[in-house]
Amino acid sequence: TPEVWVQVQMEATELSSFTVHCGFLGPGSISLVTVSWGGPDGAGGTKLAVLHPELGTRQWAPARQARWETQSSISLALEDSGASSPFANTTFCCKFASFPEGSWESCGSLPPSSDPGLSAPPTPVPILRADLAGILGLSGVLLFGCGYLLHLLRRQKHRPTPRLQPSHTNSQALTAQAWAPSQASQAALHDPYATINTSFCPATLDTAHPNGWASLPTHAAHQPQGPAASASTPILARGSFVSVENGLYTQAGERPPHTGPGLTLFPDCRGPRAVEGRFGVR
């Protein structure tokens, strides 16, 4: 069953800067992604951005930058101008649509601050990032090597002395990173008994998507929702690569050849999806 994960991050350096990451785990081609806040698409939410795999992105304040991270995940940077930092208690929702198969939506938010006395942004959670861990590890090896060389030199010049132990400084990078449980509401087109899955996703994002894809805002019209079921098993994002097999779109900025005065057809360059025509009236 396809699932959607949502992760909300707060920058440690800029507490007013937030990033929402969303990803789609499952088969099928993504035709549109809608990001909203304050609730799901069509249930009181306010749209922040829409991303289309080929046609581009559209965004609305306070969204700062929406982009594709991979073929199956997106990120949205938000700038919180208000002093009260409303993002800290806001729910962000992502809907992945695959027309006409169905759509799946999940929501997540920053977890509440561990200190009840704190009012606005939650305390950043210390997380040792992989790149810093590598640097620290390398530094440790170098320090140890230098210390050992000094030890050997001293042994040659003087009588053996007790072995020196190099002191290591251990630092951690602060990144406020909340992996929010995301409730995926699957709206399968012909399946009125679709399931809703709750899952957690670790912070793995694959290679960046070429040239930022785009999407559009629309009236929210949903397929029937099904009963909810929850699970606590972590879902890994890496390796769950979903190719966008939509033959009806062209790359942003390119105009495909017209097969008629107003009907535009697109070569099926991304997979078995059949070629589709776009509206031809201008």
């Epitope: 035709s31 027309f99 999407s215 559009l216 805002p217 929210a220 509206f279």
Partner: nanobody, 121 residues
Framework: EVQLVESGGGLVQPGGSLRLSCAAS????????MGWFRQAPGKGLEGVAH???????RYVDSVKGRFTISQDHAKNSLYLQMNSLRAEDTAVYYC???????????????WGQGTMVTVSS
């Protein structure tokens, strides 16, 4: 809960007419466009017609002059009047609500379950 419900499909002879209806409910987002897509048996999806937020209708070439798209804002409904139907119009027709990335295309964000239109003698 957002819902788009199509109706009006059925079997019709070549040259005949049908009127498809789409009742929309539950959405809160502002939208760019509403329209109709279709998928013929064994074929890909095709945008048939859509109406922009400014009320301008747009059609694919193959239906120009035969199909008319219209809206009733009071009823939150969308219609597709199909005249001079041909065998090649046989398809499942989907009502969609979507976003515009360019003037020619209404990218579906939500859609109904579809209604079958069969044109056959």
């Amino acid at each position: 809960e957002v819902q788009l419900v199509e109706s009006g499909g059925g079997l019709v002879q070549p040259g005949g007419s049908l009127r498809l209806s789409c009742a929309a409910s539950g959405y809160t987002f502002s939208t760019d466009c509403m329209g109709w897509f279709r998928q013929a048996p064994g074929k890909g999806l095709e945008g048939v017609a859509h109406i922009d937020s400014d009320g301008i209708p747009r059609y694919v070439d193959s239906v120009k002059g035969r199909f008319t798209i219209s809206q009733d804002h009071a009823k939150n409904s969308l219609y597709l009047q199909m005249n001079s139907l041909r065998a090649e119009d046989t398809a499942v027709y989907y009502c969609v609500v979507g976003f515009k990335f360019d003037e020619d295309y209404c990218a579906p964000n939500d859609w109904g379950q579809g209604t079958m239109v069969t044109v056959s003698s």
